[in-house]
């Protein structure tokens, strides 16, 4: 039995996967910030987690996925105000009783030190210094991500 949040997450990911392939992104769009091989958009307004998820989707992006502690720290360094929380693409899967990224993978317990409970209708937010479990209905800011396409040097055979 999937919760409404889980269903929303799955539906949006599936609709994103169905869209036609677009040419790779070489530069970040206006108002987006580059962080390594990603473009990040830090929202100014606030929304519950599922609206944030949907908003990123309309921008042909996804809620932020964090690979490891190093990427978390670099992302947190871009947050200017220590009091502000941002949704990322991680929520509690009731059916699997585990934290699950919106791409379907599970959280490696070593990656993020989460403050708060792992329970139904819990979603993950980050601040300048910490990672929190919040009720998914809480209205806070959010971070969208787009992957940059790496520019590969063309290798020409000897003439």
């Amino acid at each position: 039995q999937k919760s409404s949040i889980e269903k929303c997450s799955v539906d949006i990911q599936q609709s994103r996967n169905k869209t036609t392939e677009r040419p790779g992104l070489l530069n970040c769009p206006i108002y987006w910030q580059q962080l390594r091989e990603k473009c990040l958009l830090f929202s100014h307004t606030v929304n519950p987690w599922n609206n944030s998820l949907a908003d990123c989707s309309t921008k042909e992006s996804s809620l932020l996925l964090i690979r490891d502690k190093d990427e978390l720290i670099h992302t947190q360094n871009l947050i200017r105000d220590k009091a502000i929380l941002f949704w990322i693409g991680l929520n509690f899967s009731l059916s699997e009783k585990n934290w699950k990224w919106i791409n379907g993978s599970f959280l490696n317990s070593n990656d993020l030190e989460i403050r708060g409970d792992a329970k139904e209708n819990s979603c993950i937010s980050i601040s300048q210094t910490s990672v929190y479990s919040e009720y998914c209905s809480t209205e806070i800011r959010w971070i969208c991500q787009k992957e940059l396409t790496p520019v590969r040097n063309k290798v020409y055979p000897d003439s």
């Epitope: 307004t45 606030v46 609206n51 949907a54 105000d81």
Partner: antibody, heavy 117, light 110 residues
Framework: QVQLQESGPGLVKPSETLSLTCTVS????????WSWIRQPAGKGLEWIGR???????NYNPSLKSRVTMSVDTSKNQFSLKLNSVTAADAAVYYC???????????WGQGFLVTVSS | QSALTQPPSASGSPGQSVTISCTGT?????????VSWYQQHPGKAPKFMIY???KRPSGVPDRFSGSKSGNTASLTVSGLQAEDEADYYC??????????FGGGTKLTVL
Amino acid sequence: QVQLQESGPGLVKPSETLSLTCTVSGDSISSYYWSWIRQPAGKGLEWIGRIYTIGTTNYNPSLKSRVTMSVDTSKNQFSLKLNSVTAADAAVYYCARDPLGTFFDYWGQGFLVTVSS
Amino acid sequence: QSALTQPPSASGSPGQSVTISCTGTSSDVGGHNYVSWYQQHPGKAPKFMIYEVTKRPSGVPDRFSGSKSGNTASLTVSGLQAEDEADYYCSSYAGINNLVFGGGTKLTVL
């Protein structure tokens, strides 16, 4: 180049509903938020509200009870309805692109609405 | 009554600098770095000049600059030119997805 164009009836009777549409060209409506702003003759600007393309809306608290906004992504349009209008609602109405919900980088040319019986 | 307070008028001679203030509260200007400025010539739509307090969109001359101290934001126009004569409006995010404008300042180039 992004362009916005307001359209609708220029004359509305008191107590009736003002309806305006903004058509966006040169950009997909889906990637941004969109706002309505008005300016009574000789006065300052007033933010009316914004719509996200997922359908979520934020309205100016002073107008919230009378405002409805909607979006039609297939037509690249968004709309404003303001009910129970009075003479105080007569103004030039602007639609604008609202990229992050805190500023307006592209504006329509403006549309004059007169309220009179 | 506008939520943000601007002086009704400001003036300067060509080549001079003029600063227009925009005073709010800790709930709007003082509480967020989301102040923007717009220039409006008579009969025209407003033009986007400054966002996030200090950032200038492409195409806006670097004679225009923004700053903020406490609950007051400022727009400075240096090297004043005749075409800068217009109305200027500030705007600020006011929390919980709300947004407010100032009453506007008429800038006259003497």
